[in-house]
């Protein structure tokens, strides 16, 4: 099926992303009208070779003409009009630069295929992104259910056979003893010789039948154990492993993991069948002790069967002991696996074998870095002790669904101090945020005469001692869980693997979608790819090193890509969440793209994007204006940082933003949020109604207070060029003009410093009378 047709069948949430992909530079109608032809061209090659790009561009115009003729025959006036308009636009825009359209189309096609891939992955996972606990059963899981049912049936059938063989054996035993006691076996010379012979024959026949039945049962048991082994392998190596991988993904912001209940039902069912089978094997031993003979299959095979069933059950129990909720500090629910010393964290373990007889029987003990004692010392890692309630008894009462679990709510880590500031030696090759630690949970199960040692551990955690280490620690958690499903590779960062852009892009989008209502669009991700990898057409498969992601400074910047992005994530969550959720913040957009999309828009059209130069995270707006000569200019305001946004909401800044023209008149340059949303419609609802701004006016005073309002003002000076961002300052209330002693209090960044008559070039905010 053509790619375009496949895209049409996607879920609404994917179609939204598809819409974001297309703009005026490559209209969606064109993609629709010429889908088969567009998909048959090698756009990536055209994007890198001008001669080929020119050829493809001319062919494109030819295809448009052909399609136009078809619409003419169909008398489709609207489509004719649209197509003519598109052709004129393409000619005016790309005739001189055909490689640019080739690059745009190539990127769109790549992003489309990525979108299809994402949708397919989500579908395979049973659509958890939308319904984390929905009981979507895949074909594979139906097969598993079938196999489990088959195992249960075979166990029951064997139960019946065991009864039958027991009856036959009892009857044989009775006849044998009767004959023996009557002395018939010795007295073959008596009158009853023929009767005795007949009875002897019958007895031999019974023994043959007994032997056959025993052999059949032994063989069926062996077959049953193989079936159990297969189901167990599917459960532990596939279903449980999938759940664990999904848990990793959920930990780093991906789709929420599915509920464990169904897996628990399956595992419990298998465990019950195994215990029943073990009883049957024990029964064989009893039968053998009563009646045995030369070549008895029970003598031959029972020990091996017993060994196999015990091994299976033991392994199932071990696999069924899982960390249901990874360690997490309650104050940072969206950043699990990062633990700060001295701060409480919680975690929860669960046994997926739901045997009521185990309720309150299993005492769980928690420890950290259990197996790495000497290794840690050698590697120079820090060592920690777990403080708080580090033992807990598993029970079925604490959880809503009656699962057998233990939740640890009051654990803290304390660093073991040694001579050199906590590090076991000075040669530590890893920085603390690359140091990985494992939290281990241990218990012993005594069940039906078996002692089973259970042990499980958390995903690797990063331990920090200061919250400023959180960004780098979280980067480590992202990188680890993005690139490996090895649950305990604590040496991961001694040689960190390389990621591909596709992997990184997905994880970056999750950083937004997990804590806001919106992930990153293809357009936004492409901008981020450019920041990490430089300009390119197709970023798919491009490699990104750990150092590039988080350790090396970006070109021309004094900070790494991750530090910059993490501060933007923080900015979004704390200061501009509502605007981000609405989709009003374009956020990540290159200067070139910004210019391209704004230059065709009327003056007053503006967009919101993140600062590329602010390490702490900044947000700015860029608008279109016409200069005196009528030439289109693109202007940007100096970015607003968290510090400024602490004092005034971004929506209010936008609504009140003014520029002072040469004649000292305040005008608002911001009219339409790109593409054409009136500013009031977009941001009005996020501004406090004026009536609420001064509720404390003294009712007894003769004259009411004059209302004031903070606005941000940029004076236009001849130094402003389209390449330099305009600096917003604050225009003080006119009543306080020139009075530096009063007015708004200065904040750390000078945001509220009064503006003097000569308009200092500092970034400030102003009050002016209403």
């Amino acid at each position: 099926m053509a790619q375009w047709n496949q895209l049409q069948q996607l879920d609404t949430r994917y179609l939204e992303q598809l819409h974001q992909l297309y703009s005026d530079s490559f209209p969606m109608e064109l993609r629709q009208f010429l889908a088969p032809w567009i998909e048959s061209q090698d756009w990536a090659y055209a994007a890198s070779k001008e001669s080929h790009a020119t050829l493809v561009f001319h062919n494109l115009l030819g295809e448009i003409d052909q399609q136009y003729s078809r619409f003419l025959q169909e008398s489709n006036v609207l489509y004719q009009h649209n197509l003519r308009r598109i052709k004129q636009f393409l000619q005016s825009r790309y005739l001189e630069k055909p490689m640019e359209i080739a690059r745009i189309v190539a990127r769109c096609l790549w992003e489309e295929s990525r979108l299809l891939q994402t949708a397919a992955t989500a579908a395979q996972q049973g659509g958890q992104a939308n319904h984390p606990t929905a009981a979507v059963v895949t074909e594979k899981q139906q097969m598993l259910e079938q196999h489990l049912q088959d195992v249960r049936k075979r166990v029951q059938d064997l139960e019946q056979k065991m009864k039958v063989v027991e009856n036959l054996q009892d009857d044989f035993d009775f006849n044998y003893k009767t004959l023996k006691s009557q002395g018939d076996m010795q007295d073959l010379n008596g009158n009853n010789q023929s009767v005795t012979r007949q009875k002897m024959q019958q007895l031999e026949q019974m023994l043959t039948a007994l032997d056959q039945m025993r052999r059949s049962i032994v063989s069926e048991l062996a077959g049953l154990l193989s079936a159990m082994e297969y189901v167990q392998k599917t459960l532990t190596d596939e279903e449980l492993a999938d759940w664990k991988r999904r848990q990793q993904i959920a930990c780093i912001g991906g789709p929420p993991n599915i509920c464990l209940d169904r897996l628990e039902n399956w595992i419990t069912s298998l465990a019950e069948s195994q215990l029943q089978t073990r009883q049957q094997i024990k029964k064989l031993e009893e039968l053998q002790q009563k009646v045995s003979y030369k070549g008895d299959p029970i003598v031959q095979h029972r020990p091996m069967l017993e060994e196999r069933i015990v091994e299976l059950f033991r392994n199932l129990m071990k696999s069924a002991f899982v960390v249901e909720r990874q360690p997490c500090m309650p104050m940072h629910p969206d950043r699990p696996l990062v633990i700060k010393t001295g701060v409480q964290f919680t975690t929860k373990v669960r046994l997926l074998v739901k045997f009521p007889e185990l309720n309150y029987q299993l005492k769980i003990k928690v420890c950290i870095d259990k197996d790495s004692g000497d290794v840690a010392a050698l590697r120079g890692s820090r060592k920690f002790n777990i403080l708080g309630t580090n033992t807990k008894v598993m029970n079925m009462e604490e959880s809503n669904n009656g699962s057998l679990s233990a939740e640890f709510k009051h654990l803290t880590l304390r660093e073991q101090r040694c001579g050199n500031g906590g590090r076991a030696n000075c040669d530590a090759s890893l920085i603390v945020t690359e140091e990985l630690h494992l939290i281990t949970f241990e218990t012993e199960v005594y069940h039906q005469g078996l002692k089973i040692d259970l042990e499980t551990h958390s995903l690797p955690v990063v331990v920090i001692s200061n919250i400023c280490q959180m960004p780098n620690a979280w980067a480590s958690i992202l990188w680890y869980n993005m690139l490996t499903n090895n649950p305990k590779n604590v040496n991961f960062f001694t040689k960190p693997p390389i990621g591909t852009w596709d992997q990184v892009a997905e994880v970056l989008s999750w950083q937004f979608s997990s804590t806001t209502k919106r992930g990153l669009s293809i357009e936004q991700l492409t901008t981020l790819a450019e920041k990490l990898l430089g300009p390119g057409v197709n970023y798919s498969g491009c490699q990104i090193t750990w150092a590039k992601f988080c350790k090396e400074n970006m070109a021309g910047k004094g900070f790494s890509f991750w530090v910059w992005l993490d501060n933007i994530i923080d900015l979004v969550k704390k200061y501009i969440l509502a605007l981000w959720n609405e989709g009003y913040i374009m956020g990540f957009i290159s200067k070139e793209r910004e210019r391209a999309i704004l230059s065709t828009k009327p003056p007053g059209t503006f967009l919101l994007r993140f600062s590329e130069s602010s390490k702490e995270g900044g947000v700015t707006f860029t608008w279109v204006e016409k200069d005196i000569s009528g030439k289109t200019q693109i202007q940007s305001v100096e970015p607003y940082t968290k510090q400024q946004l602490n004092n005034m909401s971004f929506a209010e800044i936008i609504m009140g933003y003014k520029i002072m023209d040469a004649t000292n008149i305040l005008v608002s340059p911001l009219v339409y949020l790109y593409p054409d949303i009136p500013k009031e419609e977009a941001f009005g609802k996020y501004c406090r109604p004026e009536s609420q701004e001064h509720p404390e006016a003294d009712p007894g005073s003769a004259a009411p207070y004059l209302k004031t309002k903070f606005i941000c003002v940029t004076p236009t000076t001849c130094s402003n060029t389209i390449d330099l961002p305009m600096s917003p300052r604050t225009l003080d209330s006119l009543m306080q003009f020139g009075n530096n002693g009063e007015g708004a209090e200065p904040s750390a960044g000078g945001q509220f410093e009064s503006l003097t008559f000569d308009m200092e070039l500092t970034s400030e905010c102003a009050t002016s009378p209403m």
Partner: nanobody, 126 residues
Framework: DVQLVESGGGSVQAGGSLRLSCVAS?????MGWFRQAPGKEREGVAA????????HYTDSVKGRFSISRDYVKNAVYLQMNTVKPEDAAMYYC??????????????????????WGQGTQVTVSS
């Protein structure tokens, strides 16, 4: 459940012989034969317990009919000799899990579940 499949029925001359066979799907302690002539009640003919290998017969067939079992094949046989016209009936193989299958079972007064075959027809021509 125990499945029973009979064979060997057919037409026989009075005074002649016929051998009925029945194979069970699994071992049971007790196997036997019952019959039902048109318009009459079903009656026990012969039974053989797996304990003691002793056959039990209804009075009207004693000395003429003989019951035997093959424990390997899970089969029971009824050897009918000196067949009489009153022996004509539908013959049913029966089995039960316990091993007590003497007269009480043949009289259908014994407790416990009895499994039945579909029956095989025996006709006697004089």
């Amino acid at each position: 459940d125990v499945q029973l499949v009979e064979s060997g029925g057919g037409s026989v001359q009075a005074g002649g012989s016929l051998r009925l066979s029945c194979v069970a799907s699994t071992y049971t302690g007790c196997m036997g034969w019952f019959r039902q002539a048109p318009g009459k009640e079903r009656e026990g003919v012969a039974a053989l317990s797996s304990r003691g290998f002793a056959g039990h017969y209804t009075d009207s067939v004693k000395g003429r009919f003989s019951i035997s079992r093959d424990y390997v094949k899970n089969a029971v046989y009824l050897q009918m000799n000196t067949v009489k016209p009153e022996d004509a009936a539908m013959y049913y193989c029966a089995a039960r899990e316990g091993w007590e299958c003497g007269e009480t079972w043949l009289d259908r007064t014994a407790g416990g579940h009895t499994y039945w075959g579909q029956g095989t027809q025996v006709t006697v021509s004089s």
